[in-house]
Structure formats: structure tokens, C-alpha cells
């Protein structure tokens, strides 16, 4: 499918509309402290030479690639090296080396200021004021401070963003309609975001088998009526649009997405009887509602496994034929059977029976080796099974702000090494598998749960890989992407950590938590209690539980009183004294 | 959501003329770009034409420039397909389709031009030419 101007062919299939706002999200997500008005003129710099092409693809330079195109483009920014410093070096390389240089440079943890909500009124002014330019402002803030976010589905938010004002900016109470939605928005946008950095982690990182492989397991789940082969090509073409938006071809993915979505709507009753109402939605809707779709039916009367994969005298012939095709019919019979485990799971099984195929069809008996595979299923099915039973029996019992807490002790103890911020980050997101998962029944319990520690790890393993600090975290980021999970639960106390330095500045407050949300609030307190651990990595939960107690305390005292900051200054220091007696510091 | 109704197909002899209407009911009308594709006997869905939200901006597959003309009146909410020197290979099923998008932009940005890309969608309307 040759086309003489790439560029043409995209912004013809795509449309002006959803061409500007990919390119400004690509070139947002690749510039992150550029300034919108830069990024804009420099869109509409690019979607004038589009059109240039359109009208005639024979024009000069329209045969060029997006990522020539889009990369001089990029390379004209006139601070590029002030701004970025070592980032300009990327614009001495040629194609393809250049667009690896940006995305190497993209940051997971841009230094940019918090977004800060404003008014309801002067949001609503704005709207009003010029829709085109408040939305594409809501793109570029999303694309820069999550430079894997994915773009097709960023168009999806930016269009329940437009919704949401249109409503309620004529609502008789716009805050109270406005302001649950855009919250609703903002932890969507978050979660969507650590899901779709997985996906790009997974294919960077661990390559194309290790995707499609996650793809295989969760679509056989989710379509289990469906054929190998039409999960194979689902896989196949999941797997392209992933690796375009994960590599910048932000044009490319948005279209093979759209294609995707269609063929699925076209092809349904061969795929999943559960689509229908998706199938109706309108494109941006309906590829998140396919994304989304809950798993189908298992067909009934499906043969045991072990007749195929065990009992067969083929089964070394079969894999030795081809290996991946036959592993992957493993993965999708043994997934389409169990919607209670979770992907990770079932890729350690497959993992597995491959290891005990590769051992046992070189052996003397073959079929006497490999006999008892499925023996060895059972304590990998039972580690998460006994974990999630036991961290939601604390969940239960603690509730989510101290199961957090509880979490943040465990994890500082284990990674001592890593900044207060990312522990607080991370511990949270963890602690909130609670709410999210706990209340599903046992068959959903796991799927739900270790499918989303591996979101939330994955988070740690990218930030830690910024600046890393620990050869643990280390260790567990990158041996095994399916054995995260298993081998960050695995570490015990880190005993080579020397405990960090007394500092009374950290432990010191002022009347300003007092105007804090709730959840500031606990991002302060739980940033005091990792900094306590730090400090004294020995310490019990029964002391930690003390010091925290009369944390809360001090608060609400002085929180209450006339003089705030007097008492923060003179409170403070009593209740530092008494931490350090408490915890012998 | 939009629905789409097309008329106006039929059977003409080659070398004349069918003006094609699709009359959407549902949310505003000028939301949405519009567009005309066509498939014919086990062949694949092809674009034919398409228009802005204001109608100021027009596109055709090159097959029938210069021969079919695409307009839309958003006040009675519907979009035509004038239809000229009809030639055999124009017999089709023709099918309305709507493009939503963002729906932010100018009212004249240049509408998608792949079937992928529309968000709703007509039962379609024959048209047989004879020759």
C-alpha cells in the first residue's frame, strides 16, 4: 500500500481535524517544555505543508517520511539545546536514528508545574471564548506531562473534556455538574496512562514476542469463542498499532486503530458476542469501548488441555513444526479457560511448559519428562491466590489510607534507596488495588489485581530508570517482565541500607496543611512516614503506628487552633523530640 | 446520536443525471463533516465525496470529478450528491456517513477522507446505471 506522499495520504484519511491534533500531540509528547504557542505555530506549519502535498504529491519534499518530516520540523526550534541540552545531539543524526534519539529522550517525570484547576467561571470563559484553542491547550498539557500517553485515546478524553464543558458551562450550578467530571477525567487520564506506559515498556524493553504473547493471553480471555486464527490477527494487528504510538507514529497508529475497530464491528460474530453495543458507539468511543469490553462467555464442553498438550505422543513434533505458533496455542486454549487468572499468570505457565518442552523433547522420553507439567502449575497458581487473600483480608481491615501506609513501610524497607516522592507514588497506586480489586468476587479477584500491581510496578521500573539508585529495583525491572510482581513481593528488609540522616527540617510543618484536600494532607503525612522509615529502617509497625497517631494529632491540633503557626513551630518541635525518644534516634 | 437517511437512487440510463439527499435527525447538524462512499458488488466500500461542517471546503475521488457535485444545506439538515454523466461503473450502493471528530475545530477543516474515520451511518441507496 505505496504511497507516492505519506503525508498526503495520512491527512486525506485521517482529516485536518484529527491530523492537527495527533501532530500536536506527537510533538508535545517529543518536546515536553516547549510552549504552546511554539508548538502550535509549528503544527500549522506542518499542516500547511500537508496540504501542499494533497493538492499535489509530486511537490517537493511530500515524498519524505513523517519522521523526516516531523523531526527537521522539531529540529528548528531555536532553544532546542538551552532547553534541552543534550537532546539537541539527537538533531545531528539522520533517519531512523534520530526519531530513536527522541524517544529516548522523552521523560516520564517532566519537570513541569502542577496543573492548576482554575475557576469554574473563567474555565467556562475560555471555553466560550475559543473552543479550538482550550482544547488543544487540554492536549498539549495531557501529551507533555505523559509523553506515552495514547494518542487516539487522548482524542477520546479531549472530546469527554469538550463534553463536560458544553454541558455544564450553561448548567445552573456549572461547578457542581463540571468539577466530579473532570475529577472523573483525571484519574481515567492517569490510569490510562500507566496502562498504554506498560504496553510501550513491555515492547521496548522485553521486544514484539513479549507484547504479543500479554496480547494473545488477554484477548483469548476476552474473546473466547473466537478462533486461534482470528486472535492471531487481532494479535498481529493490536501489536502494529502499539508499536506505532509507542514509537511516535502517532498518524500511523490512530489509523490502523480506526481500521481495527472496524474490522472488529464488521467481523463480530466470528470474535465476541458482547461488542454489539460498542459496535453502535462512534469511532473514538467505540475503540475504548472494544479496549474495555468485559470477556465474553466461555464456549461450553471445552476439552480438557491435557489431551493436546500432555497426552499427545505429537506434542515435541507439534512444537518443533513451530514453536511459537504451538506455545501460543497453548497460551490462548489455557487463557480462553480462565478468565479468573491474571495475564502475568498465565504467560509464567506458558513460560513453563516451554521450559520443561525445550528440557524434555531432547530427552530420552520425551512424553515421561514432560508427563507431570501441569503439576507444576500449581504453586504458581497458589503464590498470587495466597497474596491477594491475604493483602485483601488487610485491606478489609485497615481500610485504604492506612493499608497504603502499610504498604509504604514495606516497600521502604525494601528499596530504601529510592526518592520519597516514587515510594509515596508508588505505595498509594498500590494501596488502591484495595478498593479496586477487594470487592470483586475470588474469580475476578486476580485478573483485577495482579494485572494492575504490574501497571503500578511498571511505573516504579520507569521512574527508577531515570535515575537509578538501586541495583534491586533494578534487578526486578528488567529479568523478567512477568515475574515483576513476584519479585518485588519476594525482597525482604534491605540489610546493606545504612539509614539516613537525622534531618528536623523534614519533620517540620506549617499552618499551610491546614488548607490542604484530604488527600494532601496524606501525601504529607505519608511522605513523613517513608522519610521516619528512612531514617529507621528497624523501627516496628507498633512504633510507626505511634509516631504516625500522634502525627495525626498534632495536626488536628493545631489545625484547630488560633495561633496555627505558633503551634506547628512550638508543637512541632515536642513532637520531633518525642519521635526520636519513641523510635531511639 | 445521528441518524442518516438516504434517497434518491434508481435506475438511469448512462449518461444521465440522479440527485442523491441524506437527511440526518439528531444532534446538530453542523457538527459534522459528511460524506458520500459507494460499494459495489463484492468490491470494498470506497469513498466517492465528502464535506466541511460549513460546506465551504469539498473533496472527490477522482473517478467522478468534474461529474458529481456534493452540497449541504444545514439548515434543513441534509446533504445532496448531484450526480451528472452517469457511466456504468457508477452503480453502486451509496452510502451516507457522518464525521463528528473533535467537533472543535474550524468549520471548514478539510473532513477524513477513510470510511474508518466516520462515526455514523445510512442504510445506503441503490443506484444502477444501465448502459
Known amino acids: 500500500d505505496a504511497h507516492k506522499s505519506e503525508v498526503a495520504h495520512r491527512f486525506k484519511d485521517l482529516g485536518e481535524e484529527n491530523f492537527k491534533a495527533l501532530v500536536l500531540i506527537a510533538f508535545a509528547q517529543y518536546l515536553q517544555q516547549c510552549p504552546f504557542e511554539d508548538h502550535v505555530k509549528l503544527v500549522n506549519e506542518v499542516t500547511e505543508f500537508a496540504k501542499t502535498c494533497v493538492a499535489d504529491e509530486s511537490a517537493e519534499n511530500c515524498d519524505k517520511s513523517l519522521h523526516t518530516l516531523f523531526g527537521d520540523k522539531l529540529c528548528t526550534v531555536a532553544t532546542l539545546r538551552e532547553t534541552y541540552g543534550e537532546m539537541a545531539d539527537c538533531c545531528a543524526k539522520q533517519e531512523p536514528e534520530r526519531n530513536e534519539c527522541f524517544l529516548q529522550h522523552k521523560d516520564d517525570n517532566p519537570n513541569l508545574p502542577r496543573l492548576v484547576r482554575p475557576e469554574v467561571d473563567v474555565m467556562c470563559t475560555a471555553f466560550h471564548d475559543n473552543e479550538e484553542t482550550f482544547l488543544k491547550k487540554y492536549l498539549y498539557e495531557i501529551a507533555r506531562r505523559h509523553p506515552y500517553f495514547y494518542a487516539p485515546e487522548l482524542l477520546f478524553f479531549a472530546k469527554r473534556y469538550k463534553a463536560a464543558f458544553t454541558e455544564c458551562c450553561q448548567a445552573a450550578d456549572k461547578a457542581a455538574c463540571l468539577l466530579p467530571k473532570l475529577d472523573e477525567l483525571r484519574d481515567e487520564g492517569k490510569a490510562s496512562s500507566a496502562k498504554q506506559r506498560l504496553k510501550c515498556a513491555s515492547l521496548q524493553k522485553f521486544g514484539e514476542r513479549a507484547f504479543k504473547a500479554w496480547a494473545v493471553a488477554r484477548l483469548s480471555q476476552r474473546f473466547p469463542k473466537a478462533e486461534f486464527a482470528e486472535v492471531s490477527k487481532l494479535v498481529t494487528d493490536l501489536t502494529k498499532v502499539h508499536t506505532e504510538c509507542c514509537h511516535g507514529d502517532l498518524l500511523e497508529c490512530a489509523d490502523d486503530r480506526a481500521d481495527l475497530a472496524k474490522y472488529i464491528c464488521e467481523n463480530q460474530d466470528s470474535i465476541s458476542s458482547k461488542l454489539k453495543e460498542c459496535c453502535e458507539k462512534p469511532l473514538l468511543e467505540k475503540s475504548h469501548c472494544i479496549a474495555e469490553v468485559e470477556n465474553d462467555e466461555m464456549p461450553a464442553d471445552l476439552p480438557s488441555l491435557a489431551a493436546d498438550f500432555v497426552e499427545s505422543k505429537d506434542v515435541c513434533k507439534n512444537y518443533a513444526e513451530a514453536k511459537d505458533v504451538f506455545l501460543g496455542m497453548f497460551l490462548y486454549e489455557y487463557a480462553r479457560r480462565h478468565p479468573d487468572y491474571s495475564v502475568v499468570l498465565l504467560l509464567r505457565l506458558a513460560k513453563t511448559y516451554e521450559t520443561t518442552l525445550e528440557k524434555c523433547c531432547a530427552a530420552a522420553d520425551p512424553h515421561e519428562c514432560y508427563a507431570k507439567v501441569f503439576d507444576e502449575f500449581k504453586p504458581l497458581v497458589e503464590e498470587p491466590q495466597n497474596l491477594i487473600k491475604q493483602n485483601c483480608e488487610l485491606f478489609e481491615q485497615l481500610g485504604e489510607y492506612k493499608f497504603q501506609n502499610a504498604l509504604l513501610v514495606r516497600y521502604t524497607k525494601k528499596v530504601p534507596q529510592v526518592s520519597t516522592p516514587t515510594l509515596v507514588e508508588v505505595s498509594r497506586n498500590l494501596g488502591k488495588v484495595g478498593s479496586k480489586c477487594c470487592k470483586h468476587p475470588e474469580a475476578k479477584r486476580m485478573p483485577c489485581a495482579e494485572d494492575y500491581l504490574s501497571v503500578v510496578l511498571n511505573q516504579l521500573c520507569v521512574l527508577h530508570e531515570k535515575t537509578p539508585v538501586s541495583d534491586r529495583v533494578t534487578k526486578c525491572c528488567t529479568e523478567s517482565l512477568v515475574n515483576r510482581r513476584p519479585c518485588f513481593s519476594a525482597l525482604e528488609v534491605d540489610e546493606t541500607y545504612v539509614p539516613k540522616e537525622f534531618n528536623a527540617e523534614t519533620f517540620t510543618f506549617h499552618a499551610d496543611i491546614c488548607t490542604l484536600s484530604e488527600k494532601e494532607r496524606q501525601i504529607k503525612k505519608q511522605t513523613a512516614l517513608v522519610e521516619l522509615v528512612k531514617h529507621k529502617p528497624k523501627a516496628t509497625k507498633e512504633q510507626l503506628k505511634a509516631v504516625m497517631d500522634d502525627f495525626a494529632a498534632f495536626v488536628e491540633k493545631c489545625c484547630k487552633a488560633d495561633d496555627k503557626e505558633t503551634c506547628f513551630a512550638e508543637e512541632g518541635k515536642k513532637l520531633v523530640a518525642a519521635s526520636q525518644a519513641a523510635l531511639g534516634l | 446520536d445521528v441518524q442518516l437517511v438516504e434517497s434518491g437512487g434508481g435506475l438511469v440510463q448512462a449518461g444521465g443525471s440522479l440527485r442523491l439527499s441524506c437527511a440526518a435527525s439528531?444532534?446538530?447538524?453542523?457538527?459534522?463533516?459528511m460524506g458520500w462512499f459507494r460499494q459495489a458488488p463484492g468490491k470494498e466500500r470506497e469513498f466517492v465525496s465528502a464535506?466541511?461542517?460549513?460546506?465551504?471546503?469539498?473533496y472527490y475521488t477522482d473517478s467522478v470529478k468534474g461529474r458529481f457535485t456534493i452540497s449541504r444545506d444545514n439548515a434543513k439538515n441534509t446533504v445532496y450528491l448531484q450526480m451528472n454523466s452517469l457511466k456504468p461503473e457508477d452503480t453502486a450502493v451509496y452510502y451516507c456517513?457522518?464525521?463528528?471528530?473533535?467537533?472543535?475545530?474550524?468549520?471548514?477543516?478539510?473532513?477524513?477522507?477513510?470510511?474508518?474515520?466516520?462515526?455514523?451511518w445510512g442504510q445506503g441507496t441503490q443506484v444502477t446505471v444501465s448502459s
Open positions: 464535506i466541511s461542517r460549513s460546506g465551504g471546503s469539498t
Open positions: 439528531g444532534r446538530t447538524f453542523s457538527s459534522y463533516a
Open positions: 456517513a457522518a464525521a463528528e471528530g473533535l467537533a472543535s475545530g474550524s468549520y471548514d477543516y478539510t473532513p477524513p477522507l477513510k470510511s474508518s474515520w466516520y462515526d455514523y
